[in-house]
Amino acid sequence: VPQKPKVSLNPPWNRIFKGENVTLTCNGNNFFEVSSTKWFHNGSLSEETNSSLNIVNAKFEDSGEYKCQHQQVNESEPVYLEVFSDWLLLQASAEVVMEGQPLFLRCHGWRNWDVYKVIYYKDGEALKYWYENHNISITNATVEDSGTYYCTGKVWQLDYESEPLNITVIKAPREKYWLQ
């Protein structure tokens, strides 16, 4: 039975700035080389038939739900893309993370402008701070890493704050063993 395809993002952020580029790729095995791909954006069929969907110079209208489908195989799980216009944007490798999986956060400046004195906050408390921009890279996420995150920083000598982002770390499902 062919597996459901999976949509991946490159760069891996599902929150991007207006004007940035992102490539969505429909990954899956057991697909013929010649097979075309269907892309759905907010439920509407896209004209793109390649396994990659390039969003260039992102607009607000590019926000929303994306799904892909190979041949007559089931549709992929949805991926949600959000396009922002702001000074700072907190980006995460995933907003729902399985316990034990990595979690990566970055405080991204509009137009890639330098952001300095960056502070990450979790549930309202300063978590990590440095004189320049920096990231948070958690190798093995735990349930304690769940929370509401945001970042602050200076751009062109002025202080800014990102929109908050909820991160949820869920427990990995226990393997079930059946007696034969």
């Epitope: 300095y116 004195k117 990590k128 701070y129 440095w130 004189y131 320049e132 920096h134 990231n135 190798t139």
Partner: antibody, heavy 121, light 111 residues
Framework: EVQLVQSGAEVKKPGESLKISCEGS????????IAWVRQKPGKGLEWMGI????????KYGPSFGGQVTISADKSINTAYLEWSSLKASDTAMYYC??????????????WGLGTLVTVSS | QSVLTQPSSVSGAPGQRVTISCTGS?????????VHWYQHLPGTAPKLLIY???IRPSGVPDRFSGSKSDTSASLAITALQAEDEADYYC???????????FGGGTKLTVL
Amino acid sequence: EVQLVQSGAEVKKPGESLKISCEGSGYRFSSYWIAWVRQKPGKGLEWMGIIYPYDSDTKYGPSFGGQVTISADKSINTAYLEWSSLKASDTAMYYCARLALIRGSIIFDYWGLGTLVTVSS
Amino acid sequence: QSVLTQPSSVSGAPGQRVTISCTGSSSNIGAGYDVHWYQHLPGTAPKLLIYGINIRPSGVPDRFSGSKSDTSASLAITALQAEDEADYYCQSYDSSLRSVVFGGGTKLTVL
């Protein structure tokens, strides 16, 4: 009460390896950077580098990258400074210090008492 | 050669006022990075004295004060006391070196 307790003085020969430690207590260890600062005999303070135990992010001072290794074990609230091959010029007092964010300023608010390392043949 | 330049020594009689300068550049103090001051007595751990230019942690007497202008900062000590005899270091951050930087230290002698 916040405390940084450093390991004891060491006397080593050139070429030997060494790992000194700094144990933090009285605060949430993983959520504060721990820095290492060197003071050679009769000289001033030099920033060697820093580690954030929460995610093991590490940064080194310009003269120290590749010369030493900074690590931490957040399960036992301890940071380490390690040499693979000591030189006589590594003879110094080594301090660990906590880097805190207070009223918008990033500062070394608590210091250990230092570990004296003597390297001599 | 330190990135932040301090006088190697200053001295004053008890009750007098002394200042210690800390001269940097446009990539550290002049770039707007905070300047902090530490007091270091031989055989003890360095102690935070002034942070964020002129904020005193609790327990530090108001005889100690800090100031900043352009690419330099100063520590002033009034009503000098014998127990103030120590080494004093300024500290900031340098964006070109991407490094925390200390001054070379100033030895204060109370005459």
